[in-house]
């Protein structure tokens, strides 16, 4: 009775093809025979999953990086079978979004290119999509703006598709900085105020980052010596009736509200005093 | 005017799988992503996945993997979600949303024996 | 999964008071925070995005501050139809999470 070590073992994936991560993958370890009886069954990589009694291996939600698979047959001696790819397919990982221009912060008018980089993906095949708010913006790995607006910005996110799924990059903030914009004197009550009350300007703008410095302006185009957004007239005067405007400075530039007219009648005091 | 319209409430027995649909207007499908949403009684809302309307490419929540399934159909701007093997787990209001801007008015589903 | 609590869960206040709602994420979610409004029969409204953003026709007695892992939502002057159930949701990375919600009753 001449003894041996199991024969012809083979590592055999049962579960169809191909296989994707999340998956439960059956292995089975095969042999042609043995003298005497095979008693165990080994599998490599060793320790990642409990050894199974039969010669069975389940391996539950399969991770894209379980890459080879051997089993060994044992009686007093083992033999190992040849490693099997289990050649996971999974969906593009790591999807990151990369700005490759300008190399400093983004300034109205600049050119801007993002590019999507991820780190990997099986299969290989990929469609790129960018999208911000929810809306598709472009279908190729970079998203470029010959001339930035500060409308383009917001939160962008840029997906990786292949044929198991897609994977999105976490949200990137795209900030346009811009000189003062939009300017405009708003008049509080209104732009109508009698003698002796009071009239407080406001300068309105639009900017990125926002206005540091205010400067004001009369209709002789006087600076005022008032710095701040609100110019308080109290008590308000026939005098200050006129036009007004302000400047709005901020680390970008300068802006500049049109002209508000403000009108200041006499009270009815003032009229039966004439 | 933006609109999704989601199909009626369900009632199906525990193991059946159900399919609901969610009709756009009011834009164009395949320039936007559609996300669905589930809302158990009294509870918060859970994110299921996202499909991405002109591709049909498909993200899900790992919790909804394998009890989930979206697909769109483009020539009749319709998003649709499958859900299988029920249990009285899965009974809830289900949500379609264009982003987060756009909600339908969601699908009750009643898994019951 | 970023987890998110919402707090209050249960807040009662007067047409005309103004109110906040918090949300703590437990990682930095930069200012990707929604708020949402949900009423009985009636669509889920966004409110807000990216912490601070007015999402178009949403009357300016809303607002939304804060960035990083801290968020609030403020609702100044209340009127009668903002009575309703609040979330929050982060939409920084997937899969996205909500918010347990907060239910803003009349006093």
């Known amino acids: 009775d001449v003894q041996y070590p199991p024969k012809k073992v083979t590592t055999v994936i049962q579960n169809p093809m191909p296989i994707r991560e999340g998956d439960t993958v059956t292995l089975s370890c095969n042999y042609n025979s043995s003298n005497p009886s095979v008693t165990r069954y080994e599998w490599k990589p060793h320790g990642a999953w409990e050894e199974p009694s039969l010669g069975v291996l389940k391996i539950q939600n399969v991770g894209w990086d379980n890459t080879t698979i051997a089993c060994a047959a044992c009686n007093s001696w083992c033999s190992w079978a040849s490693p099997v790819a289990l050649n996971v397919q999974y969906a593009p990982r790591d999807v990151r979004v990369r700005k490759i221009k300008p190399l400093s912060e983004i300034h109205s008018g600049n050119s801007v290119s993002l590019q999507c980089d991820f780190s990997s993906s099986h299969p290989k095949e990929v469609q790129f999509f960018w999208e911000k708010n929810g809306r598709l913006l472009g279908k190729e790995s970079q998203l470029n703006f010959d001339s930035i607006s500060p409308e383009d910005a917001g939160s962008y996110s840029c997906w990786v598709n292949n044929s198991i799924g897609q994977t999105a990059s976490k949200a990137w903030t795209l900030e346009v900085l811009y000189a003062p914009r939009r300017l405009r004197v708003s008049m509080s009550p209104g732009d109508q105020v009698m003698e002796g009350k009071s009239a407080t300007l406001t300068c309105e703008s639009d900017a990125n980052p926002p206005v540091s410095h205010y400067t004001w302006f009369d209709w002789n185009n006087q600076s005022l010596p008032y710095h701040s957004q609100k110019l308080r007239l109290e008590p308000v005067k026939v005098q200050h009736s006129g036009a007004y405007w302000c400047q709005g400075t901020n680390s970008v530039g300068k802006g500049r509200s049109p002209l508000s007219t403000l009108t200041v009648y006499y009270s009815p005091e003032t009229i039966g005093r004439r | 005017e933006v609109q999704l319209q989601q199909s009626g409430p369900v009632l199906v027995k525990p193991g059946a799988s159900v399919k609901m649909s969610c009709k756009a207007s009011g834009y164009t499908f395949s320039d936007y992503f559609m996300n669905w949403v589930k809302q158990s009684h009294g509870k918060s809302l859970e994110w299921i996945g996202i499909i991405n309307s002109y591709s049909g490419g498909t993200s899900y929540n790992q919790k909804f993997k394998g009890k989930a399934t979206l697909t769109v159909d483009k020539s009749s701007s319709t998003a649709y979600m499958e859900l299988n093997s029920l249990t009285s787990e899965d009974s809830a209001v289900y949500y379609c949303?264009?982003?987060?801007?756009?909600w339908g008015q969601g699908t009750s589903v009643t898994v019951s024996s | 999964d970023v987890q998110i609590t919402q707090s209050p869960s249960y807040l009662a206040a007067s047409p005309g008071e103004t109110i906040t709602i918090n949300c703590r994420t437990s990682?930095?979610?930069?200012?990707?925070l929604a708020w949402y409004q949900e009423k009985p029969g009636k669509t889920n409204k966004l409110l807000i995005y990216s912490g601070s953003t007015l999402q178009s026709g949403i009357p300016s007695r809303f607002s939304g501050s804060g960035s990083g892992t801290d968020f609030t939502l403020t609702i100044s002057s209340l009127e009668p139809e903002d009575f309703a159930m609040y979330y929050c949701q982060q939409h920084n990375e997937y899969p996205w999470t909500f918010g347990g919600g907060t239910k803003l009753e009349i006093k």
């Open positions: 949303a264009r982003w987060m801007d756009y």
């Open positions: 990682e930095s979610i930069s200012k990707h």
